[in-house]
């Protein structure tokens, strides 16, 4: 008996960190449900999150197939309990997302300092190489595996007894810095992709300080 009123989704937003990627939208559904489709610029549409009352859809499984591709998603609105029904133009209402290129846009997750080791007046600080959901040859790739030379880390370090910070950079996951003998230092790291224009930097890692159990001290 005619079409049931539905409203189109709006504010379609990509939320992505270390390639874990969720599309969010509004409004909360009232008497309607949603289905999401995703495609690359040259590919076919693939449906996900069928007839859901959620206002988000996890699209990670699709985008990790090729994180350097550019993706477009769209959200269809259907009347609840009558998903065959269509809008006035003879097809369900839908709204397109912005384009999304994971490699260029996914947020860098907060890094973690894996360990630090002091040998005399040098400290080696190692950053955990976080696993992503990107696969190659049936193994999950780490952040370094995916970004390679594009990813650097910045280390902030300071004496526990003062506030003056120093910085160091590395294109690996390790830093080797000079420290003053007999002083305790605190460390924080940040992941950076210098070539980006958006989402260039992660948030800072939790601070780790010497004299706590994460590190190791060896007097040589």
């Amino acid at each position: 008996s005619g079409t049931t009123n539905t409203v189109a989704a709006y504010n379609l937003t990509w939320k992505s960190t270390n390639f874990k990627t969720i599309l969010e939208w509004e409004p909360k559904p009232v008497n309607q449900v949603y289905t999401v489709q995703i495609s690359t610029k040259s590919g076919d549409w693939k449906s996900k999150c069928f007839y859901t009352t959620d206002t988000e859809c996890d699209l990670t499984d699709e985008i990790v197939k090729d994180v350097k591709q550019t993706y477009l998603a769209r959200v269809f609105s259907y009347p609840a309990g009558n998903v065959e029904s269509t809008g006035s133009a003879g097809e369900p209402l839908y709204e397109n997302s912005p384009e999304f290129t994971p490699y260029l846009e996914t947020n860098l997750g907060q890094p973690t300092i894996q360990s630090f080791e002091q040998v005399g007046t040098k400290v080696n600080v190692t950053v955990e190489d976080e696993r992503t959901l990107v696969r190659r040859n049936n193994t999950f790739l780490s952040l370094r595996d995916v970004f390679g030379k594009d990813l650097i880390y910045t280390l902030y370090y300071w004496k526990s007894s003062s506030s003056g910070k120093k910085t160091a950079k590395t294109n690996t996951n390790e830093f080797l810095i000079d420290v003053d003998k007999g002083e305790n230092y605190c460390f924080s790291v940040q992941a950076v992709i210098p070539s980006r224009t958006v989402n260039r930097k992660s948030t800072d890692s939790p601070v780790e300080c010497m004299g706590q159990e994460k590190g190791e001290f060896r007097e040589i």
């Epitope: 350097k68 550019t70 290129t101 690996t172 224009t197």
Partner: antibody, heavy 116, light 109 residues
């Protein structure tokens, strides 16, 4: 399939400038670094620099700073290298290449520049 | 700037295994140098073989493999074919720039 097609041979006068183009097809142009490489007989390959089209970010070999300038147009999937203040030392074959350590480097066919 | 050194020429026979190496003047080559191997055949035909030390590009025959041997990057051709006769260039990444080696002319006869 991935292809990089470069502009044709150029014959230029000393002091002039030239712009070489590199049209990419078959992949997402914005996400891959485009490398520029110089080849002269007896000199092997020289890396000039690179550009990431999606952001416009560039890295240059110190030797070519002031000589080469990279740009990219994502609407036409084309990268460009401009060489300025040409001398006979700039006579060479120039290549663009798409860099990717998993999917392999793809090279253009080369553009021969003669400065005379 | 770092200097990257390759054997200038090597000769092998069909079916033999041959290893080409790539040395850095700054010390041991590591995975952070993302060693790249490219083949040049006549008429300016370049083909990427190996990226990131040991990732073989799609379509490249399995006889080509990349690795680190000692303090150098290496390209090994296991069971060389006559069509592998070419010049092979390695390139190493140093924080913000690539440096090419001088190339190895491989003869297969």
């Amino acid at each position: 399939q991935v292809q990089l097609k470069q502009s044709g041979a150029e014959l230029m006068k000393p002091g002039a400038s030239v712009k070489i183009s590199c049209k990419a097809t078959g992949y997402t142009f914005s996400s891959y670094w485009i490398e520029w490489v110089k080849q002269r007989p007896g000199h092997g390959l020289e890396w000039i620099g690179e550009i990431l089209p999606g952001s416009g970010s560039t890295n240059y070999n110190e030797k070519f700073k002031g000589k080469a300038t990279f740009t990219a147009d994502t609407s036409s999937n084309t990268a460009y290298m401009q060489l300025s203040s040409l001398t006979s030392e700039d006579s060479a074959v120039y290549y663009c290449a798409r860099e990717d350590r998993y999917d392999g480097d793809y090279w253009g066919q080369g553009t021969t520049l003669t400065v005379s | 700037q770092a200097v990257v050194t390759q054997e200038s020429a090597l000769t092998t026979s069909p079916g033999e295994t041959v290893t080409l190496t790539c040395r850095s003047s700054t010390g041991a080559v590591t995975t952070s140098n993302y060693a790249n191997w490219v083949q040049e055949k006549p008429d300016h035909l370049f083909t990427g073989l190996i990226g990131g030390t040991n990732n073989r590009a799609p379509g490249v025959p399995a006889r080509f493999s990349g690795s680190l041997i000692g303090d150098k990057a290496a390209l090994t051709i296991t069971g060389a074919q006559t069509e592998d006769e070419a010049i092979y260039f390695c390139a190493l990444w140093y924080s913000n720039h690539w440096v090419f080696g001088g190339g190895t002319k491989l003869t297969v006869l």
